[in-house]
């Protein structure tokens, strides 16, 4: 997250970190069910661990943390690397979470976002770009949903209805390491960090997010079919 600020503790209990060995964060994710996460499809890896209820990026033990294995990864069937359409994936955890103030699911919004909606994006991704500098703790950033026209103007021929753009002023954006993390608007999950320009936070080049309102049926049906 570029030019965000430290999230208040306990305010993002649905935020997950996807980790490679040894404790290497590569993507964010979102708890949407006691045993299921949503993340970006481009975050798919064979072997990874899931950390929930953790505030700092470092692997130091925190009393609220819960660790899991991903036992099943189900990318949306319409996703195809290196494209960005349909960029979402469900991950089944090896067991159900223990609900606490630090670990709790969030509901996925069935309403599509309108331009001007204020949202919060969070993650442990780099705070500088193109340099790489990671934060000590989870970062939060207020962003506004942009109109689809502004989105298409920013990225000609690259935007479809499975995406929406959001941003703030130049210099504020999600970035590498934030993929799959939550965009929360009006208390529900509206999007996932997906892609954007490089370096991050360039003028008139907003972040692009997976438009989850288009996928509520697929999410529900997939969880039911695999539970």
């Amino acid at each position: 997250i570029i030019n965000g600020s430290d999230c208040d503790m306990h305010t993002q209990p649905w935020q997950a970190a996807l980790l490679l060995r040894p404790n290497q964060l590569y993507c964010g994710a979102v708890l949407v069910h006691p045993q299921w996460l949503l993340t970006a499809a481009h975050c798919r890896k064979k072997v990874f661990r899931v950390r929930l209820g953790h505030y700092s990026l470092s692997p130091v033990y925190e009393s609220g943390q819960q660790m899991f294995q991903g036992v099943k990864s189900i990318p949306h069937p319409g996703y195809s690397h290196p494209g960005h359409s349909n960029d979402l994936m469900l991950i089944k955890l090896n067991r159900r979470i223990r609900p606490t103030k630090d670990v709790r699911p969030i509901n996925v919004s069935s309403h599509c976002p309108s331009a001007g909606t204020k949202c919060l994006v969070s993650g442990w991704g780099t705070t500088k770009s193109p340099q790489v500098h990671f934060p000590k703790v989870l970062q939060c950033l207020n962003i506004s949903v942009l109109s689809q026209k502004r989105c298409e103007d920013a990225y000609p021929r690259q935007i479809d209805d499975t995406m929406f753009c959001a941003g703030d002023k130049a210099g504020r954006d999600s970035c590498q390491g934030d993929s799959g993390g939550p965009v929360v608007c009006n208390g529900s999950l509206q999007g996932l960090v997906s892609w954007g320009d490089y370096p991050c936070a360039r003028p008139n080049r907003p972040g692009v997010y997976t438009n989850l309102c288009k996928f509520t049926k697929w999410i529900q049906e997939t969880i039911q079919a695999n539970s």
Epitope: C27, P82, V132, G177, W195, G196, G207
Partner: antibody, heavy 126, light 107 residues
Framework: EVQLVESGGGLVQPGGSLRLSCAAS????????MNWVRQAPGKGLEWVSY????????DYADSVKGRFTISRDNAKNSLYLQMNSLRAEDTAVYYC???????????????????WGQGTTVTVSS | DIQMTQSPSSVSASVGDRVTITCRAS??????LAWYQQKPGKAPKLLIY???SLQSGVPSRFSGSGSGTDFTLTISSLQPEDFATYYC?????????FGGGTKVEIK
């Protein structure tokens, strides 16, 4: 078949210019960042330049900064390297290489260069 | 810039031998290291990415390990087609830099 084919190499005098081209086929060229890498006779690999998929980010090795310019035309599936003020030490085989890392995607995961051309030889000599 | 130091610069080995090549970065690069194989007159070929992930089509006798500053490429049982030069490359930080190379020769 995924393929990169370089062209444009040749013999040039010190201070001269050359333009290298790299034609891509078999993949969605506009979705990938690209690199130029060179190898002087009997020496190791030296990274020369990088260009992101949308051309929004470009970087160069210090040894070529201010003299070389990387560019691309996604509509033509082509990558270019304009080389000016050439020096004897620029003599090398020049490879274009596809970068498997998508800097547009916001995961923190880096791969490397997975597809390389056969190379084109640049000789700078009087 | 990050310096990549490979050792040894050359190694003589026989078919069936276990060969280990090391690469050291001048600063931490997490797991973001790639290994390449290059045969004379040919372009390099990606073998391993993210320090330990095998690129599609690469034989399982090749393996990589390490994180931070110290990395290793291991060929568990050297085959005739493995005689080549091997390079490491750090990929997260510009300028990208390669190690000096390790030539694996027939003993």
């Amino acid at each position: 078949e995924v393929q990169l084919v370089e062209s444009g190499g040749g013999l040039v005098q010190p201070g001269g210019s050359l333009r290298l081209s790299c034609a891509a086929s078999g993949f969605t060229f506009g979705s990938y960042a690209m690199n130029w890498v060179r190898q002087a006779p009997g020496k190791g690999l030296e990274w020369v330049s990088y260009i992101s998929s949308s051309s929004s980010f470009i970087d160069y090795a210090d040894s070529v900064k201010g003299r070389f310019t990387i560019s691309r035309d996604n509509a033509k599936n082509s990558l270019y390297l304009q080389m000016n003020s050439l020096r004897a030490e620029d003599t090398a085989v020049y490879y274009c290489a596809r970068d498997l890392t998508s800097m547009q995607s916001r995961d923190y995961y880096y791969y490397g260069m997975d597809v390389w051309g056969q190379g084109t030889t640049v000789t700078v000599s009087s | 810039d990050i310096q990549m130091t490979q050792s040894p610069s050359s190694v003589s080995a026989s078919v069936g031998d276990r060969v280990t090549i090391t690469c050291r970065a001048s600063q931490g690069i997490s797991s973001w290291l790639a290994w390449y194989q290059q045969k004379p007159g040919k372009a390099p070929k990606l073998l391993i990415y993210a320090a330990s992930s095998l690129q599609s089509g690469v034989p399982s006798r090749f393996s990589g390990s390490g994180s931070g500053t110290d990395f290793t490429l291991t060929i568990s049982s050297l085959q005739p087609e493995d005689f080549a030069t091997y390079y490491c490359q750090q990929v997260p930080i510009f300028p990208y830099t390669f190690g000096g190379g390790t030539k694996v020769e027939i003993k």
